[in-house]
Amino acid sequence: DFGLDCDEHSTESRCCRYPLTVDFEAFGWDWIIAPKRYKANYCSGECEFVFLQKYPHTHLVHQANPRGSAGPCCTPTKMSPINMLYFNGKEQIIYGKIPAMVVDRCGCS
């Protein structure tokens, strides 16, 4: 699997992973104890290039162009969890691993 990494100033046109820090305090999510912010990253860019497509099926569908099919989109193809400390609905403090919170790789799907 191949994915591009870019910074916020890059003029790269292809699907790429960009840095993004999510700040829970800025959202007003005071029920999250820790972390107050974390590096989530995000995906953006064009999806016309076969080598960035996660599945051969994506390219084949795009070529076949059936009615109602959208082109491939730049989207996370690999994600990872983070550990969080937070209050649940019963005001209990929970420590747990929350899945799919960080974008590790972007691709076209």
Epitope: H9, S10, T11, E12, S13, R14, S44, E46, E48
Partner: antibody, heavy 122, light 107 residues
């Protein structure tokens, strides 16, 4: 052949608004990023703004951010630049320019419009 | 922002002579560098992209070189139609930036 035909320039007072248009033909409009580049009288070239083919992403020079809005209508093959809160220093010839896609990075301009003059003066 | 600095501001050359124009970037722009020329009252025209690749229809007398932060445009034998203002431009980072231009005039 590729053509970019511009319209909408003119004389406007400081603080006023103006909308520039750029009608494109001769290429698949919705697959190319298009930009606006300006040139003040007797000066060099200054990039103003870029919009991607889908229109999803837009980029602006700091000097126009919050005052200018780039947009496109892919059904009409037309690019726009809505300019507001205009200042004397915005006086320039504005060019629309097509992205070449010669490489993966935006910003190589292979075709240019004829230019349209914007004069901001009281 | 990446600053692009061109030198000299004006270059006086006789027809048939060689002209070398310089462009310096304030930080690396990789190979994302283009050259344009502009004649009075006209829109700019793309000459070179990717440091050294000539655009469609550009004659072989135009050549580009360099890498990272130092670039040159060479016109091997100036023709009458080559007298114009030349701009380098980086498209590695937003905002896109142009050099201040080099005016090539008849000596």
């Amino acid at each position: 052949q590729v053509q970019l035909v511009q319209s909408g320039g003119g004389l406007v007072q400081p603080g006023g608004s103006l909308r520039l248009s750029c009608a494109a033909s001769g290429f698949t409009f919705n697959t190319y990023a298009i930009s606006w580049v300006r040139q003040a009288p007797g000066k060099g070239l200054e990039w103003v703004s870029t919009i991607t083919g889908s229109g999803y992403n837009t980029y602006y020079a700091d000097s126009v951010k919050g005052r200018f809005t780039i947009s496109r209508d892919n059904s009409k093959n037309t690019l726009y630049l809505q300019m507001s809160s205009l200042r004397a220093e915005d006086t320039a010839v504005f060019y629309c320019a097509k992205d070449s896609r010669y490489n993966w990075n935006y910003g190589i301009f292979d075709y240019w419009g004829q230019g349209t003059t914007v004069t901001v003066s009281s | 922002d990446i600053q692009m600095t061109q030198s000299p501001a004006t270059l006086s050359v006789s027809p048939g002579e060689r002209a070398t124009l310089s462009c310096r970037a304030s930080q690396s722009v990789s190979s994302n560098l283009a050259w344009y020329h502009q004649k009075p009252g006209q829109a700019p025209r793309l000459l070179i992209y990717g440091v050294s690749t000539r655009a469609t229809g550009i004659p072989a007398r135009f050549s580009g070189n360099g890498s990272g932060t130092e670039f040159t445009l060479t016109i091997s034998s100036l023709q009458s139609e080559d007298f114009a203002v030349y701009y380098c431009q980086q498209h590695n980072n937003w905002p896109l930036t142009f050099g201040g231009g080099t005016k090539v005039e008849i000596k």
